[in-house]
Amino acid sequence: AGVFELQIHSFGPGPGGAPRSPYSARGPCRLFFRVCLKPGLSEEAAESPCALGAALSARGPVYTEQPEAPAPDLPLPNGLLQVPFRDAWPGTFSLIIETWREELGDQIGGPAWSLLARVTRRRRLAAGGPWAGDIQRAGAWELRFSYRARCELPAVGTACTRLCRPRSASRCGPGLRPCAPLEDECEAPPVCRAGCSLEHGFCEQPGECRCLEGWTGPLCMVPVSTSSCLGLRGPSSTTTGCLVPGPGPCDGNPCANGGSCSETPGSFECTCPRGFYGLRCEVSGVTCADGPCFNGGLCVGGADPDSAYICHCPPGFQGSNCEKRVDRCSLQPCRNGGLCLDLGHALRCRCRAGFAGPRCEHDLNDCAGRACANGGTCVEGGGAHRCSCALGFGGRDCRERADPCAARPCAHGGRCYAHFSGLVCACAPGYMGARCEFPVHPDGVSALPAAPPGLRPGDPQRYP
């Protein structure tokens, strides 16, 4: 057992990268990091589990963009990212570091997360060694970090496979060396097969020589897949540098925990029993207790190493560990040229003028998709539409009950009465017309226009 440790030194625009922060026009935000460790150097599917483990950093300090200011290195979370591993350290591994931004502004729905950068490195690393530094570019971003793997007592060695056993004596006896940091813990290093590479091999039993991943041969001197004689097997020939017939890669069964070995060109493959993973079945089963589901994924099953777990991912994430962000905007949900905004928990479509609806599917300028309520009719014209409302109704969709008298349509002190089909004006003495707009001369004749026959001054005038 042991711990992989990652220290982020800086994250910011690389040389020739973004001259301005990509945070412009956004509110305050803060960074956090996620690290994922996978055993082996092989190109793995993006959604394959972080079988060696994973960790999430704390949130960094809140950062607010200064408009027009050059983008500085961004404030980082405090502390190391630590990924505990159980059993052996594989020696070769894939390291995935994701830089996430959490926006804290007034955007709808609270904080929103977006992936700023993702770097993947395939590395060889012995446990117990010094910090290894690295600088990686991801687009316009540059990430500087260091990492190391260290064993946790009583495990020691380059693969954390040898165990320190406590000794009763306060000083170590002959042939025993101290297991730092405690003087009264000592280990007897197993005597490996003569000539076994100190750098690329290890042993748990005397006379054994087991290779770290990426190395092969009886003495672990031959890098996997680098020889020009991969069809042959055996120790390296001193004359040609090629392999000569000898022990096969499955000799001595390099597969741990009951795994079965089968030969592949120049190497071997372990078929692991349920609950074990890794090139040599050295990684024990991941359970829900290990927290394998990221980004708020819900882990079900996997109560013990022999039962599989399943991550139920929250919206916006997928993959067996919810480690892959879904780009739902790539599905082009926004219609009619709408702009898609992925808020993580939801999408937002910002519609062009003339369109509306959750996905801009509603054409506001189209009577076909437009309904005018209460018997109103839709009238198109000039690239737009309007509702011609039935009497007694108004508003954009004719949904509002109109008060025909609200606008005081009756002139010269006439009284307005609402009528089921409109309004009626009862004119004051001396006036007539639909809106009492015409004064009546003393001889009973209106000025303009002529009153319809049968109407006397003061009669109610109906206004259609």
Epitope: G109, R359, E361
Partner: antibody, heavy 118, light 107 residues
């Protein structure tokens, strides 16, 4: 956990009114369009209405226009459907459903039954 | 309004079978199609959106395909819990409309 709980169903006479409510929890209600969908007994699903996050846009199926009104109260995390001039054909289980943006209905309530009968 | 028609309206199958349900739109709807599962007395459950994208938490035994007017839902290795009614639904334009449903029964 996302939860939508409808209430307000019951027996109502033709021409009568009923107000349905949907209480939302487990998510930021004010960030989502919301929908009402109904299902007549033994029949299929029919979308009824939806409303924008801030209530500024509302859309209805033709058969309920002018009779039903969808509304929301973001402070109370609640969605409403005011149903007037009810008809026998409005008898159905009414579901509220959330629209996350990529498709209309990702989470549904358990439904509330409205029966229009004399 | 866009009409959605599903076929067959009912289907009998055995545990372990693979089945397909088809859905046809009366006019082109691009990939603006969703599939839902409903069990008696329960609310519908979202399975697939954008014609082929699996909703979060839905097992990969469900898959969707198609574009334009013709769409398919496939369910592999049927289990007892998969026997239910399945609906397709278009969200290309208002009003959103559903197919009439396909009832999947155990043989």
């Amino acid at each position: 956990e996302v939860q939508l709980v409808e209430s307000g169903g019951g027996l109502v006479q033709p021409g009568g009114s009923q107000r349905l409510s949907c209480a939302a929890s487990g998510f930021t209600f004010s960030s989502y369009w919301m929908n009402w969908v109904r299902q007549a007994p033994g029949k299929g699903l029919e979308w009824v209405a939806n409303i924008k996050e801030d209530g500024s846009e509302k859309y209805y199926v033709d058969s309920v226009k002018g009779r039903f009104t969808i509304s929301r109260d973001n402070a109370k995390n609640s969605l409403y459907l005011q149903m007037n001039s009810l008809r026998a054909e409005d008898t159905a289980v009414y579901y509220c459903a959330r629209d996350p943006g990529w498709a209309p209905f990702d989470y549904w309530g358990q439904g509330t039954l409205v029966t229009v009968s004399s | 309004d866009i009409q959605m028609s599903q076929s067959p309206s009912s289907l009998s199958a055995s545990v372990g079978d693979r089945v397909t349900i088809t859905c046809r739109a009366s006019q082109g709807i691009s990939n603006y199609l969703a599939w839902f599962q409903q069990k008696p007395g329960k609310a519908p459950k979202s399975l697939i959106y954008a014609a082929s994208s699996l909703q979060s938490g839905v097992p990969s035994k469900f898959s969707g395909s198609g574009s334009g007017t013709d769409f398919t839902l496939a369910i592999s290795s049927l289990q007892p819990e998969d026997f239910a009614t399945y609906y397709c639904q278009q969200y290309n334009s208002f009003p959103y409309t559903f197919g009439q449903g396909t009832t999947l029964e155990i043989k």
